[in-house]
């Protein structure tokens, strides 16, 4: 079997996080969200080729389909495996809070 | 907002559970598995529109950033919320054992 | 490289108030708060509060409130400090810092003002 | 308001000793704690973020673990420019609370 973390594509061409830096305008958070107003949002991107980084037997089998039926089954698909959480100053009634999101920021990736 | 159910790109068009019938042989394991010989794969294809089945604010971002910078962050993809387990009859050294995976059959779909 | 550069120190008498401005440069000064935390002589941090530039919403301690007011001014990218009021016991360093960022993150901050307060 | 509370409050090392230095928050602070260092006169410096994240530019002999309440700084071996005190923080909440600090001392 192929190496599960060597992407057969070539260099960064494969399923991985990268990280986008946003403005809160972008996000669509500009009113609830204070602070911080810029933020490094990491995600999961790439291609999901035989073999690379399967998730589980579901992406196996996704594959195997794929190659048979390209047209009905789609490739897996390259998906956060785990979440960093994230901390966001928001208004509230009565002032402002720390408030903490755990599913905003992709931590390491799969495909699925 | 929208109905997080509700396709806005008509009926089946979007991210939902489809089964697929598939041989073993299709799925690569006729020299492992004995029994059963053909499979209901169930698996989740779809668009995933904005708003649609979002599983949590890290595919609203998504969608978000893939409406900006198509080119750089994919739209939220259809993948599994949840799995069936399935029982495979296998071949072992000893003889023949059943098997449960809980892995294999997607139960319900989210938009990640 | 991101920078706050705090005014000058200052001599108070009890009962006076006093204004500490910090200037920031090298970011965007409305992306993030300003907090303001100080330190007595041989004491620990004590953090005072808490202003994002993009709005002007505030955050005070407890113990603080009514006797001091934090303010922004995004033309000239400077947070300013203004404690009334004041007693010995406010003989301090105060500093002013960035954050908190979406670690939680508290990661730059002034060279610290020093403000006494002594009849 | 979330109480944190540092052990021990001084420590004397050598150069080349591995110092663990304590932090407990009062309920749970997920992993929203910081590390900083400060030196006689000067800024504190921030060493560790979330817990356990390196602040960029900091060496690799301090590390920091734990999440919930309980917190710990390590330095893996002590360096001269180590001596110092060093203080957590969490940013949970509002208030932004401290540790009453910990001084690191030459034995």
């Known amino acids: 079997a192929r190496n599960g973390d060597r992407c057969p594509l070539g260099p960064g061409r494969c399923c991985r996080l990268h990280t986008v830096h946003a403005s809160l305008e972008d996000l669509g958070w500009a009113d609830w969200v204070l602070s911080p107003r810029e933020v490094q949002v990491t995600m999961c991107i790439g291609a999901c080729p035989s073999q690379f980084r399967e998730a589980n037997m579901h992406a196996q089998i996704k594959m195997n389909l794929h190659r048979l039926k390209p047209d009905t089954v789609p490739a897996p698909c390259c998906v956060p495996a785990s979440y960093n959480p994230m901390v966001l100053i928001q208004k509230t009634d009565t002032g402002v809070s720390l408030q903490t999101y755990d599913d905003l920021l992709a931590k390491d990736c799969h495909c699925v | 907002a929208r109905n997080g159910d509700r396709c806005p790109l008509g009926p089946g068009r979007c991210c939902r559970l489809h089964t697929v019938h598939a041989s073993l042989e299709d799925l690569g394991w006729a020299d492992w598995v004995l029994s059963p010989r053909e499979v209901q794969v169930t698996m989740c294809i779809g668009a995933c529109p904005s708003q649609f089945r979002e599983a949590n604010m890290h595919a609203q971002i998504k969608m978000n950033l893939h409406r900006l910078k198509p080119d750089t962050v994919p739209a939220p993809c259809c993948v599994p919320a949840s799995y069936n387990p399935m029982v495979l009859i296998q071949k072992t050294d000893t003889g023949v054992s059943l098997q449960t995976y809980d892995d294999l059959l997607a139960k319900d779909c989210h938009c990640v | 490289q991101v920078q706050l550069v705090q005014s000058g120190a200052e001599v108070k008498k009890p009962g006076a108030s006093v204004k500490v401005s910090c200037k920031a440069s090298?970011?965007?000064?409305?992306?993030?708060?300003i907090n303001w935390v100080r330190q007595a002589p041989g004491q620990g941090l004590e953090w005072m509060g808490w202003i994002t530039a993009y709005s002007g919403d505030t955050n005070y301690a407890q113990k603080l409130q009514g006797r001091v007011t934090m303010t922004t001014d995004t033309s000239t990218s400077t947070a300013y400090m203004e404690l009334r009021s004041l007693r010995s016991d406010d003989t301090a360093v105060y500093y002013c810092?960035?954050?908190?960022?979406?670690?939680?993150?508290?990661?730059?901050w002034g060279q610290g003002t020093m403000v006494t307060v002594s009849s | 308001d979330i109480q944190m509370t540092q052990s021990p409050s001084s420590v004397s090392a050598s150069v080349g000793d591995r110092v663990t230095i304590t932090c407990r928050a009062s309920?749970?602070?997920?992993?929203?704690l910081a590390w900083y260092q400060q030196k006689p006169g000067k800024a504190p410096k921030l060493l560790i973020y979330?817990?356990?994240s390196l602040q960029s530019g900091v060496p690799s002999r301090f590390s920091g673990s734990g999440s919930g309440t309980d917190f710990t700084l390590t330095i893996s071996s002590l360096q001269p420019e180590d001596f110092a005190t060093y203080y957590c923080q969490q940013a949970n909440s509002f208030p932004i609370t401290f540790g009453g600090g910990t001084k690191v001392e030459i034995k």
């Open positions: 090298g970011y965007t000064f409305t992306s993030y708060g």
């Open positions: 309920q749970g602070i997920s992993s929203w």
């Open positions: 810092a960035r954050g908190p960022g979406q670690y939680a993150d508290v990661d730059v």
């Open positions: 979330a817990a356990s």
